[in-house]
């Protein structure tokens, strides 16, 4: 199919810095021990929300908000001695750009949270 | 500079699902709340390993490994009637590919661990 | 124009230093990563280190780990090569290169290639 008119060419000298990247992924199927087992058991339980971008590849990426602002101690109640607090990590994703071309990306990072784990507050002490 | 034969092409026919992805990465400087404060602090603590490959983009990514079978109660020792389980994420990063070619990359997943979180054990009863 | 000029090659005497620099014009360095390679008079070129474009992390072939040190200044469009313990067989015409990305151990991976700079070490 013909190039989308304002799409960017590889050869484009306005457009230096392009790679061809083949989205045929490798370890398609990486065995992911989904945390989805864990999200409940936790003593800092998170619910998991769907982020989606149908320009952004991948276009479906869960995101991590922790339940309670304390820990959920042996007997189920919420503890505020302790926090629950997201564990974050960058990660890349293609981003389409111009957003009408077919296949021309953007490199772009994007924080996500993962899951929450229970922490010890630091106690600031007034003078 | 001329193509390297056997290099890809965007007009490739065999190479369907090449795209090109623009460098000039956005967000580059994410405000990453870097867990390296609550590795430390989690009742779930953990160690963060550098796995480091020079041909990947991006080239180090950290691995969070769980400290303790068990996890850290308000004491600090180890309680094992809970156990630290690693938050697993699946990530995308780039390889060259063809590994001579200048700019042709494919993306490929990795599942990373990114911290611990403590859960309640699954406990199987035997009849 | 593109290209990349290294600089700082020269005579020095076994055991001494030399500071090699490679700029970059006509394009920025921030999504290459850079690599040194050597080649001395009858041998074939080899790699001898690179940095990243992600986050600066650097390797090294054996014969040079511990005494080269490379480094990146992404504002002045510049890498280096700082070589310490200088030995007669460091003597070689010094090449730095851009490849987009990632370090690669294939020479075709480098977009771009400089003239060479002549490191002589010798008593």
């Known amino acids: 199919s013909p190039q989308n008119p304002g799409c960017p060419n590889a050869e484009d000298k306005n457009f230096p810095r392009t790679v061809m990247v083949n989205l045929n992924i490798r370890n398609r199927n990486t065995n992911s021990k989904r945390a989805s087992d864990y999200y409940n058991r936790s003593s800092s339980p998170w619910n998991l929300h769907r982020n989606e971008d149908p320009e952004r590849y991948p276009s479906v990426i869960w995101e991590a908000k922790c339940r309670h602002l304390g820990c959920v101690d042996a007997d189920g109640n919420v503890d505020y001695h302790m926090n629950s607090v997201p564990i974050q990590q960058e990660i890349l994703v293609l981003r389409r750009e111009p957003r009408h071309c077919t296949n021309s990306f953007r490199l772009e990072k994007m924080l996500v949270s993962v899951g929450c784990t229970c922490v010890t507050p630091i106690v600031r002490h007034v003078a | 500079s001329p193509q390297n034969p056997g290099c890809p092409n965007a007009e490739d026919k065999n190479f369907p699902r090449t795209v090109m992805v623009n460098l000039n990465i956005r967000n580059r400087n994410t405000n990453s709340k870097r867990a390296s404060d609550y590795y430390n602090r989690s009742s779930s603590p953990w160690n963060l390993h550098r796995n480091e490959d020079p041909e990947r983009y991006p080239s180090v990514i950290w691995e969070a490994k769980c400290r303790h079978l068990g996890c850290v109660d308000a004491d600090g020792n180890v309680d094992y009637h809970m156990n630290s389980v690693p938050i697993q994420q699946e990530i995308l990063v780039l390889r060259r590919e063809p590994r001579h070619c200048t700019n042709s990359f494919r993306l490929e997943k990795m599942l990373v661990s990114v911290g611990c979180t403590c859960v309640t054990p699954i406990v199987r009863h035997v009849a | 124009e593109v290209q990349l000029v290294e600089s700082g090659g020269g005579l020095v005497q076994p055991g001494e230093s030399l500071r090699l620099s490679c700029k970059a014009s006509?394009?920025?360095?921030?999504?290459?990563?850079l690599g040194w390679f050597r080649q001395a008079p009858g041998k074939e070129r080899e790699g001898i280190s690179c940095i990243t474009s992600s986050d600066a992390s650097a390797y090294y072939t054996d014969s040079v780990k511990g005494r080269f040190t490379i480094s990146r200044d992404n504002s002045k469009n510049t890498v280096y090569l700082q070589m310490n313990s200088l030995k007669t067989e460091d003597t070689a015409i010094y090449y730095c290169a851009a490849a987009l990305l990632t370090c690669s151990s294939y020479y075709d991976a480098y977009t771009y290639w400089g003239q060479g700079t002549q490191v002589t070490v010798s008593s």
């Open positions: 006509g394009f920025s360095l921030d999504y290459y990563a």
